[in-house]
């Protein structure tokens, strides 16, 4: 089978601090040494890129400094964390994996993780 399968959890609940983490696992059909991982957000059939990182197998993922994502890799598994989430960011987050080098190129796209974000209630003023 030449197609690449990507697995990710169906649902994740963000923490009260607006942080959501999930694992993106891919079944590699090739011996890739350079992998690109992209997180996409799908809302109302519109797809936008949230963040992306390219890494060498065995090394850590490096997202851009201003990225809302961080992550670690272990074999064919990537642990992704998205921070700074608010209720309006609730949506389907898709893990896209590309085996970039050596050729041939392979693409794998997960079914998406529905991330629910609930804004924390403001603390009521208290009298002491």
């Amino acid at each position: 089978c030449k197609a690449m399968h990507v697995a990710q959890p169906a649902v994740v609940l963000a923490s009260s601090r607006g942080i959501a983490s999930f694992v993106c696992e891919y079944a590699s059909p090739g011996k890739a040494t350079e992998v690109r991982v992209t997180v996409l957000r799908q809302a109302d059939s519109q797809v936008t890129e949230v963040c992306a990182a390219t890494y060498m197998m065995g090394n850590e993922l490096t997202f851009l400094d201003d990225s809302i994502c961080t992550g670690t890799s272990s074999g064919n598994q990537v642990n992704l964390t998205i921070q700074g989430l608010r209720a309006m960011d609730t949506g389907l987050y898709i893990c896209k994996v590309e085996l970039m080098y050596p050729p041939p190129y392979y693409l794998g796209i997960g079914n998406g993780t529905q991330i629910y974000v609930i804004d924390p209630e403001p603390c009521p003023d208290s009298d002491f």
Epitope: K2, V47, L107
Partner: antibody, heavy 118, light 107 residues
Framework: EVQLVESGGGLVKPGGSLRLSCAAS????????MNWVRQAPGKGLEWVSS????????YYADSVKGRFTISRDNAKNTLYLQMNSLRAEDTAVYYC???????????WGQGTMVTVSS | EIVLTQSPATLSLSPGERATLSCRAS??????LAWYQQKPGQAPRLLIY???NRATGIPARFSGSGSGTDFTLTISSLEPEDFAVYYC?????????FGPGTKVDIK
């Protein structure tokens, strides 16, 4: 408006060279991988080459490997295809196409005709 | 290289009829399959990606189905502007390959 416009096609003799250009507008060119696809007269579509957003990764069809070179200039929002050692079988309309975020070729140019004949 | 086979080569139908086009891959492409429409003298236009997702602006009469090696593009009721050539493409691995096309013409 999202647009791709190819140029540089023409008539060239076998063994000759040609450089095609594809000018992009209406989107952040530097964020997308790009492709060249060709179509011989009356025939189907054939993928030629692909280049990643930062030019780090390049792929070619076996039929053009060693003869064609894909490149891009993100500052100029332009994709290129340098074609050397041209053969009669390279005669085709050449299209540039953008790779959408989900993988398919979502935006295509109108094409430029390349004719290789003596 | 993944080889895509399309059938039939030509489909002769009348406006209002249902068109069913088939695409078969030589090995599994999962759901990394797209359908394109091409009219004479024009560039291809993306219709369907991910085997079943309509691209932006594509009418609901176009639908795609299938996964693995067998795929179908259905046009529920042909409009005059739908008579064209349709190509399937796999984009899951390089080299990216296209099927030979199915021509839908007016009976």
């Amino acid at each position: 408006e999202v647009q791709l416009v190819e140029s540089g096609g023409g008539l060239v003799k076998p063994g000759g060279s040609l450089r095609l250009s594809c000018a992009a507008s209406g989107f952040t060119f530097s964020s997308y991988s790009m492709n060249w696809v060709r179509q011989a007269p009356g025939k189907g579509l054939e993928w030629v080459s692909s280049i990643s957003s930062s030019s780090s990764y390049i792929y070619y069809a076996d039929s053009v490997k060693g003869r064609f070179t894909i490149s891009r200039d993100n500052a100029k929002n332009t994709l290129y295809l340098q074609m050397n050692s041209l053969r009669a079988e390279d005669t085709a309309v050449y299209y540039c196409a953008r790779v959408g975020l989900m993988g398919p070729f979502d935006i295509w140019g109108q094409g430029t005709m390349v004719t290789v004949s003596s | 290289e993944i080889v895509l086979t399309q059938s039939p080569a030509t489909l002769s139908l009348s406006p209002g009829e249902r068109a069913t086009l088939s695409c078969r891959a030589s090995q599994s492409v999962s759901s990394y399959l797209a359908w394109y429409q091409q009219k004479p003298g024009q560039a291809p236009r993306l219709l369907i990606y991910g085997a079943s997702n309509r691209a932006t602006g594509i009418p609901a009469r176009f639908s795609g189905s299938g996964s693995g090696t067998d795929f179908t593009l259905t046009i529920s009721s042909l409009e005059p502007e739908d008579f064209a050539v349709y190509y399937c493409q796999q984009y899951g691995s390089s080299p990216f390959t296209f099927g030979p096309g199915t021509k839908v013409d007016i009976k």
